[in-house]
């Protein structure tokens, strides 16, 4: 070491280099001082004078000890999909990073040049690789026994809840729905148990695998508002019998109202002696289709008296959308004087013995010619344990609806036209056929 410290500028010893925070100026051939971060060289050194430094102007910076004639310009303002994680100062450049829910598709030395939104996995798909600051989410189909009912960039597939008795089997995009006995839960406490409304945003992945074929039951198991997340058991508290009873009572009241109205307008009845039969459909045929299982049960002339019945059945339909389509077949598709509901069956687990509950509710509305109304409500229900799933029921098994069906004749219609139209539009009214099976 030299005995005394040399002050800049100074000529270096041959073969040696300048000290830290100094640079060798080729013109002056001297070791000169560098400028500190936040400054730049305003005047370069000479043999007799050291470097003159000056502060960087606004929106410019120097991050290192330097001898640059001008400070560097800060990068442009962050775009709307970015957040400024480091502001532009005299000593550092602005740094933009992607905001939450986005990742950096094109990076630069510091921060990100181009952000892109994280891919969202649609229902039936879950996150198989979470996104990071620099990589996108990867979605994969939910494995058998798991589901995702959200459109999300963070949700993974979750196992279906385990039911003692399954009301609706789960599929890739929907959790299993249990009947009123408590299920065992695959999830940790606090997980949401019932399927939430699913979004249908488009997705950059393969098509969703086809959901399981079991159709949903119309209005027997209403999917009402989501239950609270914590402490919820995920089942329906009302017993099935009570729901059926209330439904039958409601239909009876509607029938009575119709009778009163028809009595007042003095319409004469036409009672059709005929037996309606509902065969059990295989599950694949029952899925979201209108087949022979839907029978013409009640025909009314287009009049104001049908509106209460129509809106009632419509409301019932709307309460439980089917799994494969936005809405169960409802009154929207039928004529002004018709009301519909749908029947369905749920397939039990393969090889399992399913407990099948068939419930049939029919309202017969008749009024006699002497204007004293005779209204009967007849419900035929068959309940029992079957050794096979509902879809394997014998072809000739029939559920009798009623020996008598009545239609009201309007001035425009004749018995022939009414009879002739019975083959055209299916018209079951709230006839749930729910297969309820142990898991």
């Amino acid at each position: 070491l030299p005995a005394q410290v040399a002050f800049t500028p100074y000529a270096p010893e041959p073969g040696s280099t300048c000290r830290l925070r100094e640079y060798y100026d080729q013109t002056a051939q001297m070791c000169c001082s560098k400028c500190s971060p936040g400054q730049h060289a305003k005047v370069f050194c000479t043999k007799t004078s050291d470097t003159v430094c000056d502060s960087c102007e606004d929106s410019t910076y120097t991050q290192l000890w330097n001898w640059v004639p001008e400070c560097l310009s800060c990068g442009s303002r962050c775009s709307s999909d970015q957040v400024e994680t480091q502001a532009c100062t005299r000593e550092q450049n602005r740094i933009c990073t992607c905001r939450p829910g986005w990742y950096c598709a094109l990076s630069k030395q510091e921060g990100c040049r181009l952000c892109a939104p994280l891919r969202k996995c649609r229902p039936g798909f879950g996150v198989a690789r979470p996104g990071t600051e620099t990589s996108d989410v990867v979605c994969k189909p939910c494995a058998p026994g798991t589901f995702s009912n959200t459109t999300s960039s963070t949700d993974i597939c979750r196992p279906h809840q385990i039911c003692n008795v399954v009301a609706i089997p789960g599929n890739a995009s929907m959790d299993a729905v249990c009947t009123s006995t408590s299920p065992t839960r695959s999830m940790a406490p606090g997980a949401v148990h019932l399927p939430q409304p699913v979004s249908t945003r488009s997705q950059h992945t393969q098509p969703t695998p086809e959901p399981s074929t079991a159709p949903s039951t119309s209005f027997l198991l209403p999917m009402g508002p989501s239950p609270p997340a914590e402490g919820s058991t995920g089942d329906f508290a009302l017993p099935v019998g009570l729901i059926v009873g209330v439904t039958a009572l409601g239909l009876l009241i509607i029938g009575v109202v119709n009778c009163v109205i028809m009595t007042q307008v003095k319409k004469k009845p036409l009672c059709l002696q005929r037996e309606a039969k509902v065969p059990h459909l295989p599950a694949d045929k029952a899925r979201g289709t209108q087949g022979p299982e839907q029978q013409h049960l009640l025909i009314t002339a287009p009049s104001s008296s049908s509106s209460s019945l129509e809106s009632s059945a419509s409301a019932l339909d709307r309460r439980a959308p089917t799994r494969n389509q936005p809405q169960a077949p409802g009154v929207e598709a039928s004529g002004a004087g018709e009301a519909r509901a749908s029947t369905g069956s749920s397939d039990s687990s393969p090889g399992g013995h399913g407990t099948q509950v068939n419930v049939t509710c029919i309202v017969n509305v008749c009024s006699s010619s002497d204007h004293s109304s005779q209204c009967s409500s007849q419900a035929s229900s068959t309940m029992g344990d079957t050794d096979s799933s509902p879809s394997e029921s014998p072809k000739d098994e029939q559920v009798p609806f009623s020996k008598e069906e009545c239609a009201f004749r309007s001035q425009l219609e004749t018995p022939e036209t009414l009879l002739g139209s019975t083959e055209e539009k299916p018209l079951p009214l709230g006839v749930p056929d729910a297969g309820m099976k142990p898991s």
């Epitope: 879950g126 198989a128 690789r129 993974i156 940790a188």
Partner: antibody, heavy 118, light 110 residues
């Protein structure tokens, strides 16, 4: 049914490479990642990496970043693990698997014993 | 590099007892993004995934198995041990782009 069938046992010299195969059947191979895990004699499990058969993207454990190569051939539904610059410490049973904490698709190969000795 | 430590290395219990297996992350709290993962290994049998995701039991896994997590630890609890539960259990945690397994816990009959 779903199966992952691995290739047979291998004996290699130090410095050599080994390539283990894993043939998937009973499902669409592109639907789930394939993981490679190994277990040295009397030791625990060690995660090597995983490959997405759909696009070939890979993720490796830091220890295997330089020596392991995972690939897939979707036409034959087969995944491969190649391990280079073998050392005696690489003697282990190597397993392919579809299980991870994201998918719950729980299938494992029967394992391939790789022995590295001079 | 992240290290996942399982404890105890060996746990001796009797059927009917409750087993608590711990898994600790060296890199700070185990968040939901670590996606704790438990695997069972029985001699001469295929591995079996037990718990995944955010402490969910895999399909078909009995209810006596449960996962939980707080702070740097994630825990596997077997509420009432059955004879078939005696095995080696591994946990794995997800670290941004890779899984790291713990050293395993051997659950043996007392």
């Amino acid at each position: 049914q779903v199966q992952l069938v691995q290739s047979g046992a291998e004996v290699k010299k130090p410095g050599a490479s080994v390539k283990v195969s894993c043939k998937a059947s009973g499902y669409t191979i592109t639907d789930f990642y394939i993981h490679w895990v190994r277990q040295a004699p009397g030791q625990g499990l060690e995660w090597i990496g995983r490959v997405d058969p759909e696009d070939g993207n890979t993720e490796y454990a830091p220890n295997f970043q330089d020596r392991a190569t995972m690939t897939t051939d979707t036409s034959t539904s087969t995944a491969y693990l190649e391990l280079s610059s073998l050392r005696s410490e690489d003697t282990a049973v190597y397993y392919c698997s579809t299980w991870d904490g994201f998918s719950y698709f729980d299938y494992w190969g029967q394992g391939t014993t790789v022995t590295v000795s001079s | 590099e992240a290290v996942v430590t399982q404890s105890p290395a060996t746990l001796s219990l009797s059927p009917g007892e409750r087993a608590t297996l711990s898994c600790r992350s060296s890199t700070g709290p185990v968040t939901t993004n670590n996606y704790a993962n438990w695997v069972q290994q029985k001699p001469g049998q295929a591995f079996r995934g037990l718990i995944g995701g955010t402490n969910d039991r895999a399909p078909g896994i009995p209810a006596r198995f449960s996962g939980s997590g707080s702070g740097t630890d994630t825990t596997l609890t077997i509420s009432s041990l059955q004879p078939e539960d005696f095995a080696v259990y591994y946990c794995a945690l997800w670290y941004r782009n890779h899984w790291v397994f713990g050293g395993g816990t051997k659950l043996e009959i007392k």
